[in-house]
């Protein structure tokens, strides 16, 4: 019975971009400006997201899909669907409550977002440090000391840090 009723429900014929208008005898009406319905059979249209302030429009709202926001330069997205914008820091830094702070010795951040992470522990994998870490770069692990030919130097100085490093995603 439920299935039969749903097949007879006139609202089920209303496609995305429309809503089933109870005030007009359940006729499918187009979504009003600045609203959308992404699925068929909707009884209302949803209000479009507005990208204001630190948010900027990545994709305009259409009758069938919501607007999508990203962040203005100097900020990056956080949360599902870019629900927040967070300030960028420089490589070699992390964002704290007091602003951008340099990574402590033994940690690095090769992006403009996120936290300072400890350098990789190469010995965990039986490897040795091939290139030293910096505030901006992780170490590069190399073969275990036993794999090195006699007299070969195992550690390379770090490559000079350059901008741009890992781009904010």
């Amino acid at each position: 019975f439920e299935r039969t009723r749903s097949l007879q429900d006139p609202c089920s014929n209303c496609p995305a971009g429309t809503f089933c208008d109870n005030n007009r005898n359940q006729i499918c009406s187009p979504c009003p400006p600045n609203s959308f319905s992404s699925a068929g059979g909707q009884r209302t249209c949803d209000i479009c997201r507005q990208c204001k302030g630190v948010f900027r429009t990545r994709k305009e709202c259409s009758s069938t899909s919501n607007a999508e926001c990203d962040c203005t330069p100097g900020f990056h997205c956080l949360g599902a669907g870019c629900s927040m914008c967070e300030q960028d820091c420089k490589q070699g830094q992390e964002l704290t409550k007091k602003g951008c702070k340099d990574c402590c010795f033994g940690t690095f951040n090769d992006q403009k977002r996120g936290i300072c992470r400890p350098w990789t522990n190469c010995s965990l994998d039986g490897k040795s440090v091939l290139v030293n870490g910096t505030k901006e770069r992780d170490v590069v692990c190399g073969p275990s000391p036993a794999d090195l030919s006699p007299g070969a130097s195992s550690v390379t100085p770090p490559a000079p840090a350059r901008e741009p490093g890992h781009s904010p995603q």
Partner: antibody, heavy 119, light 107 residues
Framework: QVQLVQSGAEVKKPGASVKVSCKAS????????INWVKQAPGQGLEWIGN????????NYNQKFKDKATITADKSTSTAYMELSSLRSEDTAVYYC????????????WGQGTTVTVSS | DIQMTQSPSSLSASVGDRVTITCQAS??????LNWYQQKPDKTVKLLIY???RLRSGVPSRFSGSGSGTDFTFTISSLQPEDIATYFC?????????FGQGTKLEIK
């Protein structure tokens, strides 16, 4: 030895979703980045994104930001990639990879999972 | 994104030949350049990392050189088992990007 074993081939209809798994063994799962890489038929390799399982921090290639969701389950040492709203151009082999010790190279590759999108 | 231009796209050589593949980055990537081998069965293996470092267990006939934007991968004496497609990849900047690949065949 270090191993990444991926789930089997999938055939999906357009508009559907698929979740590919990558089970890691032979190392401390939480200490290395897991990457996902796409190879469309007859094409080259494209980096989709990665995850650091210790805290589930992710990076995405902007191109795949609305397509792929990467997650990790520390309790089973398994990484996942879910692809949504599948289209024919998502037909490809998807690889998971582990870094070599620091994120800058990929030392271990899974065997690949073929995802076919066809109506 | 950093573009990686790999050449040639295909190459036919004889057993024992010296084979060279080049990879050019659209901007300076320091030494964060890796080379991978993809066999016909689709298995992928890291051969060289950080421009010139040979992965443990990889035969010494494989080598790499370069820095900045220009990189070279060499097989000093081609063996039948080297039939594969070879890819370069930059690990300097997200998103990581690959060259288009070089398909190597035996004459």
């Amino acid at each position: 030895q270090v191993q990444l074993v991926q789930s089997g081939a999938e055939v999906k209809k357009p508009g559907a979703s698929v979740k590919v798994s990558c089970k890691a063994s032979g190392y401390t799962f939480t200490s290395y980045w897991i990457n996902w890489v796409k190879q469309a038929p007859g094409q080259g390799l494209e980096w989709i994104g990665n995850i650091y399982p210790s805290d589930s921090y992710t990076n995405y290639n902007q191109k795949f930001k609305d397509k792929a969701t990467i997650t990790a389950d520390k309790s089973t040492s398994t990484a996942y990639m879910e692809l949504s709203s599948l289209r024919s151009e998502d037909t490809a082999v998807y690889y998971c990879t582990r870094d070599y010790g620091s994120a800058y190279s990929m030392s271990t590759w899974g065997q690949g999972t073929t995802v076919t999108v066809s109506s | 994104d950093i573009q990686m231009t790999q050449s040639p796209s295909s190459l036919s050589a004889s057993v024992g030949d010296r084979v060279t593949i080049t990879c050019q980055a659209s901007q300076d990537i320091s030494n964060y350049l890796n080379w991978y081998q993809q066999k016909p069965d689709k298995t992928v293996k890291l051969l060289i990392y950080y421009t010139s470092r040979l992965r443990s267990g990889v035969p010494s006939r494989f080598s790499g050189s370069g820095s900045g934007t220009d990189f070279t991968f060499t097989i000093s004496s081609l063996q039948p088992e080297d039939i594969a497609t070879y890819f370069c990849q930059q690990g300097d900047t997200l998103p990581y990007t690959f060259g288009q690949g070089t398909k190597l065949e035996i004459k």
